[in-house]
């Protein structure tokens, strides 16, 4: 289970945002961000130091329809 | 091509530091993960951390925390590991390695040649 | 962390056989498995990724398959090239770790 303060890395966090974002896809780092390519992303936010769920859904390619 | 090339091996006492460079060439520096890994006399290898040469952001294995530090220089395109308070049991061959995968993955595809560390006394 | 337990330690084969070598994981890591070669005073190369995924530039007569917590590397027509060392390692959470190693040696 997917839990606050956890650090997910490799295979768990694409597993997870696999899940989290389901058909809609995802991004290693967010497409309005201009910065260097890796400088910051969400290896850096979620392997590096710990995220949440509102932040990893923060990379889902499209937001989710609301029904 | 690309090509990782590692400082020359190192004698040290223990209690001592040791700091090993890794130059990289034949490709952008910033875009790809530097992992270390060690691999002691005739035993296996073991992963010690990761760094993002692009903003330096690091993270190391819970078993080095504390004596472990991986930098880099952009201008030189040159990562660094430096392990302090050193002991016998960290007489090893270090090695960088390039993660080939945006995710850091741990799928390394071009390693340095290898510095041999040894500490005795 | 997460446990990897390679089998056989070493194997005696001939050029031209086929080879197995089995990695086990403590707990269930998908596909997420790497196999490198390693040969005497060299760095380890990358073979295999993500369980069955070829690295370009090795022969395929390199093949991975397994998910979950097991996993099988065979070399098919083995040649004088391929006797050395050979390591799995997971790459599903950190701290990434190693199996033991499976040395395959010439009979």
């Known amino acids: 289970a997917y839990g606050p303060g956890e650090t997910l890395c490799g295979g768990e966090l694409v597993d997870t945002l696999q899940f989290v974002c389901s058909d809609r896809g995802f991004y290693f780092s967010r497409p309005s961000s201009r910065a260097n390519r890796r400088s910051r992303g969400i290896v850096e936010e979620c392997c590096f130091r710990s995220c949440d769920l509102a932040l990893l859904e923060t990379y889902c390619a499209t937001p989710a329809k609301s029904e | 091509q690309v090509q990782l090339v590692e400082s020359g091996a190192e004698v040290k006492k223990p209690g001592a530091s040791v700091k090993v460079s890794c130059k990289a060439s034949g490709y952008t520096f910033t875009s790809y993960y530097m992992h270390w890994v060690r691999q002691a006399p005739g035993q296996g290898l073991e992963w010690m951390g990761i760094?993002?040469?692009?903003?330096?952001?690091?993270s190391y294995a819970q078993k080095f925390q504390g004596r472990v530090t991986m930098t880099r220089d952009t201008s030189t395109s040159t990562v660094y590991m430096e392990l302090s308070s050193l002991r016998s049991e960290d007489t090893a061959v270090y090695y960088c390695?390039?993660?080939?995968?945006?995710?850091?993955?741990?799928?390394?595809?071009?390693w340095g040649q290898g510095t041999l560390v040894t500490v005795s006394s | 962390d997460i446990q990897m337990t390679q089998s056989p330690s070493s194997v005696s084969a001939s050029v031209g056989d086929r080879v197995t070598i089995t990695c086990r994981a403590s707990?269930?890591?998908?596909?997420?498995l790497v196999w490198y070669q390693q040969k005497p005073g060299k760095a380890p190369k990358l073979l295999i990724y993500?369980?069955?995924r070829l690295q370009s530039g090795v022969p395929s007569r390199f093949s991975g398959s397994g998910s979950g917590t097991l996993f099988t590397l065979i070399i098919n027509n083995l040649q004088p090239e391929d006797f050395a060392t050979y390591y799995c390692?997971?790459?599903?959470?950190?701290?990434?770790?190693f199996g033991g190693g499976t040395k395959v040696e010439i009979k």
């Open positions: 390695a390039r993660d080939r995968s945006i995710a850091a993955m741990g799928w390394f595809d071009h």
């Open positions: 707990q269930g890591i998908s596909s997420w």
């Open positions: 993500a369980a069955s």
């Open positions: 760094i993002n040469p692009s903003g330096g952001s690091t």
């Open positions: 390692q997971q790459s599903n959470s950190v701290p990434l770790t």
